[in-house]
């Protein structure tokens, strides 16, 4: 069997619970970029998460080749009916991926949009977004996933999780 | 044109109606799956579904070759609201992906997961989840997709699928 | 660093606003398809969109080079409600990937469907789709997108788009 | 401050009826589904009926369909529950909880069911 | 119907001491499950919601979590306040069922 190993450039990193610092403060440096960035992912559960030849740092994966990724996250949003007074019904759901270059400012890539049901009856929401995508990176670009309404996030592994490989 | 028939590790296969054994009983072997796993997928529909160094057995694509696959399944939930006495039986809609390993039990690699509309007003479904994500498999491992609510779920070939391939 | 380029045969194609020919007429040549083909797809945004080693033409990506493709689109549907009084607020949101071959109707690979919010609390919809799958194709096969409901369509670059690479 | 206070509880003869009464306060209590539970002498907690805010659905265990009615009257914050053909396995405490998700609870009413 | 099955059904345990509840699941509940307290006198109180939520007002001694199809309450050190008892409550479908309920008693 051939020997693939060495040409793989790849990387699926998932959801972690519990820690305090799983999506940035609104006014971290990337306060240009809509919603909150995730940055509690983990890249060494076995069998769930990998990096190779990619790197993980503050939530981001930082590209060490230049070439065409296919960059995909899924987020897991679960929330239910509680007793809040004075809000809205209707929460609207949005995943942004988004890149950094030499450029100051975050570009974005690719967003997905969901909004709850508005019924007065609904109890719970359980909503996954999964989008990806194809893009030329360069070294040193890194990518990042934020999100709007990040307390609804469930962070389990295989609920919510970002990944990327080199294509060709 | 360079050959690239050789380096090919790929499968897409696709729901198939009308078959008693499309989704395994509640019993069978993975009884610690979450859902019900889908059997009956079609791997030879001209055009549509095939296997390429990857095989299909009672449901699940069998693993030829250790490496990084990106895994992906779409599954569509079709269904005609039913009032029964002003209850509203609302639905969760969860598709599960699982492996396989030499560990006896399934090991979920990702979940995503949708609860239909709860307005009384609501007269029908659809509902189409799809999920993808890169995973760490070896020779052997099996991989295989459960649903919950399965008797909703739209076994057209362009409507539900499962498929996998080997990156880099 | 090896020189993957040559092997690349890729493509990201965006959404682009305010062109009149963004959707196919009714009655343009794949009247055999469901829903409305888009036509409007931006191949040349720099670090957005890209075309290598296929080409765009009529909406549609055209295979230069035989072999399994990973397909994908995602399309991103917003609305205002509308209070009609008597009407039915509900809407189907369908996706579809279609591919013309030498034979003369295109064939339907994937589908993919939402229905709207049945609530008459509803005030707006938003709703991407997503899907993605592997399907072989062969030198001068066509792929294309369409869609119900075109004129709901969000065509920013970020949030509707259609890709494919050339697998393995 | 939520504050969920049942009563009418008592003694009630087997194949009577009683109807059990939750004043609801601190919320918009149009806005949430209610709930009732009970509390067997065994101390096995029972899920008994749901209906939700605007009173367009309610819920009931199969056991208990056709002899308990959920409802309530958003104008006055209260919410019911009317039991007829009581049986001496009605014997509990029967709690109020708001929303579905029963997120408080009353402090309860005794109810017997007893020749 | 979803079962839900609690364990143990009784504890006893000193103070200071660390202890963890647990619920099963027979059916995917999508981390819809809660975890009540119920002191002698009949109070019923939520301490967490969505599997691993703490109320707000609840100490953080109390946690919950999830793998699988399994939910736990854990209690990290004793105190006098928490000898009660304790049942979990899945509020993702119609019927909601409870546990079937944990003492936990002074050792």
């Known amino acids: 069997v051939r020997e693939r190993g060495p040409q793989r450039v790849a990387a699926h990193i998932t959801g972690t619970r519990g820690r305090s610092n799983t999506l940035s403060s609104p006014n971290s440096k990337n306060e240009k970029a809509l919603g909150r960035k995730i940055n509690s992912w983990e890249s060494s559960r076995s069998g769930h998460s990998f990096l190779s030849n990619l790197h993980l740092r503050n939530g981001e994966l930082v590209i060490q080749e230049k070439g065409f990724y296919y960059i995909y996250s899924q987020t897991y949003f679960r929330f239910q009916e509680e007793i809040k007074e004075n809000t809205k019904n209707d929460k609207q759901m949005v995943q942004y991926i988004y890149k950094y270059t030499s450029y100051p400012d975050p570009i974005l890539l690719m967003k997905s949009a969901r909004n709850s049901c508005w019924s007065k009856d609904a109890e719970y929401g359980l909503y996954s977004i999964y989008q990806g995508g194809l893009f030329e990176l360069k070294k040193d670009d890194r990518i990042f996933v934020s999100v709007t309404n990040e307390h609804l996030i469930d962070m389990d592994h295989e609920a919510s999780f970002f990944g990327a490989f080199l294509v060709g | 044109v360079r050959e690239r028939g050789p380096q090919r590790v790929a499968a897409h296969i696709t729901g198939t109606r009308g078959r008693s054994n499309t989704l395994s009983s509640p019993n069978s072997k993975n009884e610690k799956a979450l859902g019900r796993k889908i059997n009956s997928w079609e791997s030879s529909r001209s055009g549509h579904s095939f296997l390429s160094n990857l095989h299909l057995r009672n449901g699940e694509l069998v693993i030829q070759e250790k490496g990084f696959y990106y895994i992906y399944s779409q599954t569509y939930f079709r269904f005609q609201e039913e009032i029964k006495e002003n209850t509203k039986n609302d639905k969760q809609m969860v598709q599960y992906i699982y492996k396989y390993t030499s560990y006896p039990d399934p090991i979920l690699l990702m979940k995503s997961a949708r609860n239909s509309c709860w307005s009384k007003d609501a007269e029908y479904g659809l509902y189409s989840i799809y999920q993808g994500g890169l995973f760490e498999l070896k020779k052997d491992d099996r991989i295989f997709v459960s649903v919950t609510n399965e008797h909703l779920i739209d076994m057209d070939h362009e409507a539900s699928f499962f498929g996998a391939f080997l990156v880099g | 660093v090896r020189e993957r380029g040559p092997q690349r045969v890729a493509a990201h194609i965006t959404g682009t606003r305010g062109r009149s020919n963004t959707l196919s007429s009714p009655n343009s040549k794949n009247e055999k398809a469901l829903g409305r083909k888009i036509n409007s797809w931006e191949s040349s945004r720099s670090g957005h969109s890209f075309l290598s080693n296929l080409h765009l033409r009529n909406g549609e990506l055209v295979i230069q080079e035989k072999g399994f493709y990973y397909i994908y689109s995602q399309t991103y549907f917003r609305f205002q409600e509308e209070i009609k009084e008597n009407t039915k607020n509900d809407k189907q949101m369908v996706q579809y990937i279609y591919k013309y071959t030498s034979y003369p109707d295109p064939i339907l690979l994937m589908k993919s469907a939402r229905n709207s919010c049945w609530s008459k609390d509803a005030e707006y919809g938003l709703y991407s789709i997503y899907q993605g799958g592997l399907f072989e194709l062969k030198k001068d096969d066509r792929i294309f997108v369409s869609v119900t409901n075109e004129h709901l369509i969000d065509m920013d670059h970020e949030a509707s788009f259609f890709g494919a690479f050339l697998v393995g | 401050e939520v504050m969920l206070v049942e009563s009418g509880g008592g003694l009630v003869q087997p194949g009577g009826s009683l109807k059990l009464s939750c004043a609801a306060s601190?919320?918009?209590?149009?806005?949430?589904?209610m709930s009732w539970v009970r509390q067997t002498p065994e101390k096995r907690l029972e899920w008994v009926a749901t209906i939700s805010g605007g009173g367009s659905y309610t819920y009931y265990p199969d056991n208990l369909k056709g002899r308990f009615t959920i409802s309530r009257e958003n104008a006055k914050n209260t919410l019911y529950l009317q039991m007829s053909s009581l049986r001496s396995e009605d014997t509990a405490m029967y709690y109020c909880?708001?929303?579905?998700?029963?997120?408080?609870w009353g402090q309860g009413t005794s109810v017997t069911v007893s020749s | 119907d979803i079962l839900l099955t609690q364990s143990p059904s009784s504890l006893s345990a000193s103070l200071g001491e660390r202890v963890s509840l647990t619920c099963r699941a027979s059916q995917e509940i999508s981390g819809f499950l809660s975890w009540l307290q119920q002191k002698p006198d009949g109070t019923i109180k939520r301490l967490i919601y969505a599997a691993s939520t703490l109320d707000s007002g609840v100490p953080k001694r109390f946690s919950g979590s999830r793998s699988g199809s399994d939910y736990s309450l854990t209690i990290s050190s004793l105190e006098s306040d928490d000898f009660a008892d304790y049942y979990c409550?899945?509020?993702?479908?119609?019927?909601?069922?409870f546990g079937g309920g944990t003492k936990l008693e002074i050792k």
């Open positions: 601190g919320f918009t209590f149009s806005n949430y589904g």
């Open positions: 909880a708001a929303p579905t998700a029963m997120d408080y």
């Open positions: 409550l899945q509020y993702a479908s119609y019927p909601r069922t």
